[in-house]
Interface confidence: medium
């Protein structure tokens, strides 16, 4: 067989669909691998071929497009299931070819079961809402292309297991769900069930997403350095371990990169010769504000180390801050016992 550009198994596009529901799956070649679309390919005389490998099998086989009621069909660059069955799970390949050109890619399709409360192994998209920020909406995702605009589906929204009706601050508005004022108590899984008719049959589309209420940009502040601070002095004798934590609070900011770093005498620890280790830990509040701690450690501090400047720096989209730690050498206490003993003429 002639050479075919094989893009392999595209695990980045692990597709999950619910059992017994319609699914439309676009060939990933045109979305992610090729620089032209299906229409261009079709008009250039290229043909799109589909085949699949069943779960736990090695054999590639053609897809049966002659099932009753056209359960599986292809339309342009889309593979349709009306509806899916559990044993449709497998790796699907779409191949674009003519006598001189060939390109193909495979992708995994998993058909998953859900219970009556919409729980399933499905990976859920997360939608972030700002706390106490005014009206915000989520939209029932991935339902475009399933029915024509002339069809008016019915949409029912659920929070967890419960149908959303007469909720205080959550109002269903067709494909949208409006949150009048988002609160921590609105965290959870929200499901829309879209019901539509097609050729005398009724189909259901179930879409679940996770709502996470996060800190509002109205409340966002530049990073706050809790430690080091003016109340704490790191007073050490040479040979002792020096531990200085830098603990920084970051307000939640969408797509902000939070950074914490130490400088010693104005240089990054990697750029100096002293034996420094830095350990980092991160924790989050319920609204995804972040507290980062970087502990600077010098196992056996020298008197030279105790004269250096240790500065903790932090940066977010809201600004940059820095704070120096107060480090000093401990003054040895006078040895009163010996001096007093001598003074009293002890032998």
């Amino acid at each position: 067989s002639e050479r075919c550009d094989d893009w392999g198994l595209d695990t980045m596009r692990q597709i999950q669909v619910f059992e017994d529901e319609p699914a439309r799956i676009k060939c990933p070649l045109f979305e992610h691998f090729l620089k032209f679309n299906y229409s261009t390919a079709h008009s250039a005389g290229l043909t799109l071929i589909w085949y699949w490998t069943r779960q736990d099998r090695d054999l590639e086989e053609p897809i049966n497009f002659r099932l009753p009621e056209n359960r599986i069909s292809k339309e342009k660059d889309v593979l349709w299931f009306r509806p899916t069955l559990l044993n449709d799970t497998g790796n699907y390949t779409c191949m674009l070819r003519n006598t001189t050109y060939c390109s193909k890619v495979a992708f995994p399709l998993e058909v998953v079961q859900k219970d009556s409360c919409f729980n399933s192994p499905m990976k859920l998209p997360v939608h972030k809402l700002y706390i106490e920020y005014g009206i915000q909406r989520i939209t029932c995702p991935n339902v475009d292309g399933y029915f024509p605009s002339s069809v008016k589906p019915t949409i029912t929204w659920y929070m967890g297991c419960y149908k959303i009706q007469n909720f205080n601050n959550v109002i269903p508005e067709g494909m949208n769900l409006s949150f009048l004022i988002a609160l921590i108590s609105n965290n959870g899984n929200y499901t829309c069930v879209v019901t539509y008719p097609e050729n005398g049959r009724t189909f259901h589309l179930t879409r679940t997403l996770t709502v996470k209420v996060v800190g509002s940009p109205k409340n966002a502040v530049p990073p706050v350095i809790h430690s080091p601070n003016d109340h704490v002095v790191y007073e050490k004798e040479p040979g002792e371990e020096l531990l200085i934590p830098c603990t920084v609070y970051f307000s939640f900011l969408m797509d902000s990169r939070n950074e914490v770093w130490w400088t010693i005498d104005g240089k990054k620890p990697d750029d100096i010769t002293i034996d420094v280790t830095i350990n980092e830990s991160i924790s989050h509040s319920r609204t995804e504000d972040e507290t980062r701690t970087q502990i600077l450690s010098i196992k056996k501090v020298t008197s030279e180390d105790l004269k250096r400047s240790y500065v903790c720096h932090a940066r977010s989209a809201k600004g940059e801050v820095a704070k120096a730690a107060k480090v000093k050498q401990k003054v040895p206490a006078p040895r009163y016992t010996v001096e007093l003993a001598c003074g009293f003429g002890a032998t």
Epitope: V221, V224, H226, S227, N229, H231, V232, V233, Y234, E235, L243, I244, P245, T247, Y249, S251, S281, D289, T291, T293, I295
Partner: antibody, heavy 123, light 112 residues
């Protein structure tokens, strides 16, 4: 999860001294202030002092200066309070309590508490 | 030092009642954006438990019937509908500035 486990009850003679312990787990011990709070039977809460484990920096309620000494052992994540020259007035339950971290620069609340150690000073 | 005065020192309520405890500081414990006033609940033989921090922030896991308000020198803890498990002693606590923290003298909430 955060836990503060305090040492067991103590019965000591007047004039003696005692060292109470508070073992922390479930968080980065050196990065949070550790406080000690006294509660006499049937009375309210009285702040004794606090220590920052990373540096050993301490602050005391002036009423307990010379009475209480706060120390830590960072290798075992344990805070200690040493009480000296004990009298019946020192009989109380002593709690260790961690300060939280919050967005604000200072003024922390006591978010986790040990179960308390009962100290009885009696001859 | 800042003194805290709680009132009343004891309060009788029935299940379902609304209960209000106030705490007055001898000087302001607020600055721009927050107040260093916190509320704790203590049951006999148990350690205090943080309910409200920074005057109005409900601590994680605390029922929403508890709420806090106030700024400057006057603060309030409110239980909107007292439940059987709420009968306990309540303390206000300020942590304004280092190095001195103080507590109110406590308010005992009793069954009527």
């Amino acid at each position: 999860h955060v836990q503060l486990q305090q040492s067991g009850p103590e019965l000591v003679r007047p004039g003696a001294s005692v060292k109470l312990s508070c073992k922390a787990s479930g968080y980065i011990f050196i990065t949070y202030w550790m406080n000690w709070v006294k509660q006499r039977p049937g009375q309210g809460l009285e702040w004794v002092g606090q220590i920052f484990p990373a540096s050993g920096t301490t602050y005391y309620n002036e009423l307990f200066e010379g009475k209480a000494t706060l120390t830590v052992d960072t290798s075992s994540n344990t805070a200690y309070m040493h009480l000296t020259s004990l009298t019946s007035e020192d009989s109380a339950v002593y709690y260790c309590a961690r300060t939280d971290f919050y967005r604000y620069d200072g003024g922390y609340a006591l978010d986790y508490w040990g179960q308390g150690t009962s100290l009885t000073v009696s001859s | 030092d800042i003194q805290l005065t709680q009132s009343p020192s004891s309060l009788s309520a029935s299940v379902g009642d609304r209960a209000t405890i106030t705490c007055r500081a001898s000087q302001s414990v607020s600055t721009s954006g927050y107040s260093s006033m916190h509320w704790y609940q203590q049951k006999p033989g148990k350690a205090p438990k943080l309910l409200i921090k920074y005057a109005s922030d409900l601590e994680s896991g605390v029922p929403s019937r508890f709420s806090g308000s106030g700024s400057g020198t006057d603060f309030t803890l409110t239980i909107s509908s007292v439940q059987p498990e709420d009968f306990a002693t309540y303390y206000c606590h300020h942590s304004w500035g280092i190095p001195m923290y103080t507590f109110g003298q406590g308010t005992k909430l009793e069954i009527k």
